[in-house]
């Protein structure tokens, strides 16, 4: 028996993805567990094996469609289920019905680039990746900037409350090597969470003038 | 926060049948996995069931698979347990109890943040 804590949490990229982790306390490294997707107002059902991703806790991805194809909708509910081998049988060890656009993670945002470099300021562009168009422009961004001596922890949270895919970064330090990173979230759903962060652009400003402060 | 006040205990001779309800206030009921778990004296809490928050799935302990049977009405902020083909084994006090918002239904007690009160079921032989 499990005496600790165990807990299900999966996310919609609002495409065609449901990632999933399962983590149960105290749980052998071994366990071959599964989730089952099955959802109300759909033909498919869906697998996937939960590869271990910590000492306790297991992850996979319900790859619905491909990458682009909208495959859930507002109104859809999935019944999602874990179900661990024991010996010969297969016993389910957690369930839940799973409503994909009230627990929505994006995919991070990609295609990152320097439009315009100066002394002091950057201007940065992105896309959005998978992202349904059902959001419209109901879209919110975080981005951080790394600066030299410190760490992305320590970056100040710049917001936009917008569907704006890029930034001017603005009093910047010239002949500066920076890092940039940028995460996306829609405004719909009580468990939508954030993006994970984009992989991070390097930049660097340009050296002042000579003869000029 | 979420309250649970379960009812429909009693004394039942082995072979018979029980219905218990849970009544929900507080919260969107509709938003939370429900179960039901057990204690008899002596012994550790243990799991009965538990149901989704449409009622669409449902998973049961080995040793009630196939006599009890969780259900649920919305509309109604109650749940239901219903026992049938009863044993001197299944005597325990009844508990019906929720996870938080949006959170999974699992077999482990330690999962659960909302508890009633108990009901006692006593199953004579």
């Known amino acids: 028996a499990v005496n600790g804590t165990s807990r299900f949490t999966c996310f919609y990229n609002s495409r065609a993805n449901i990632s999933c982790v399962w983590s149960q306390d105290g749980a052998l490294q071994d366990t071959s567990c599964q989730v089952h997707a099955w959802p109300d107002r759909r033909r498919w059902n869906q697998t996937c094996e939960l590869l271990p991703v910590s000492q306790a806790s297991w992850a996979c991805n319900l790859i619905l469609g491909t990458p682009d194809s909208q495959k859930l909708t507002a109104v859809d509910i999935v019944t999602l289920r874990v179900m661990c081998r024991e010996g010969v049988r297969w016993r389910m060890m957690a369930i839940q019905d799973f409503k994909p656009f009230e627990n929505l993670r994006l995919m991070a945002p990609i295609s990152l680039q320097v439009v315009h470099v100066e002394t002091h300021r950057c201007n940065i562009s992105w896309k959005i990746s998978q992202a349904s168009h059902y959001f419209e422009r109901h879209l919110e961004f975080e981005a951080r900037t790394l600066s030299p001596g410190h760490t992305w922890e320590e970056a100040p949270l710049m917001t936009l409350k917008q569907k704006q895919e890029w930034i001017c970064l603005e009093t910047l330090t010239p002949d500066t090597q920076y890092e940039f990173q940028v995460r996306v979230k829609p405004l719909q759903g009580e468990f939508t969470t954030w993006s994970p962060w984009s992989q991070p652009l390097a930049f660097r400003t340009k050296p002042a003038a000579l003869g000029k402060d | 926060q979420v309250q649970l006040q379960e009812s429909g205990g009693g004394l039942v001779q082995a072979g018979g049948s029980l219905r218990l309800s849970c009544a929900a206030s507080?919260?969107?009921?509709?938003?939370?996995?429900m179960a039901w778990f057990r204690q008899a004296p002596g012994k550790e809490r243990e799991f009965v069931g538990a149901?989704?928050?449409?009622?669409?799935?449902?998973f049961y302990a080995d040793s009630v698979e196939g006599r009890f049977t969780i259900s649920r009405i919305n509309d109604k902020n109650t749940v239901y347990l219903q026992m049938n083909s009863l044993k001197p084994e299944d005597t325990a006090v009844y508990y019906c109890?929720?996870?938080?918002?949006?959170?999974?239904?699992?077999?482990?007690?330690?999962?659960?943040?909302?508890w009633g009160q108990g009901t006692q079921v006593t199953v004579s032989s």
């Open positions: 109890s929720a996870p938080r918002s949006g959170r999974a239904g699992t077999r482990n007690q330690m999962d659960y943040e909302y």
């Open positions: 149901i989704t928050q449409t009622g669409r799935g449902t």
């Open positions: 507080g919260r969107t009921f509709s938003n939370y996995v």
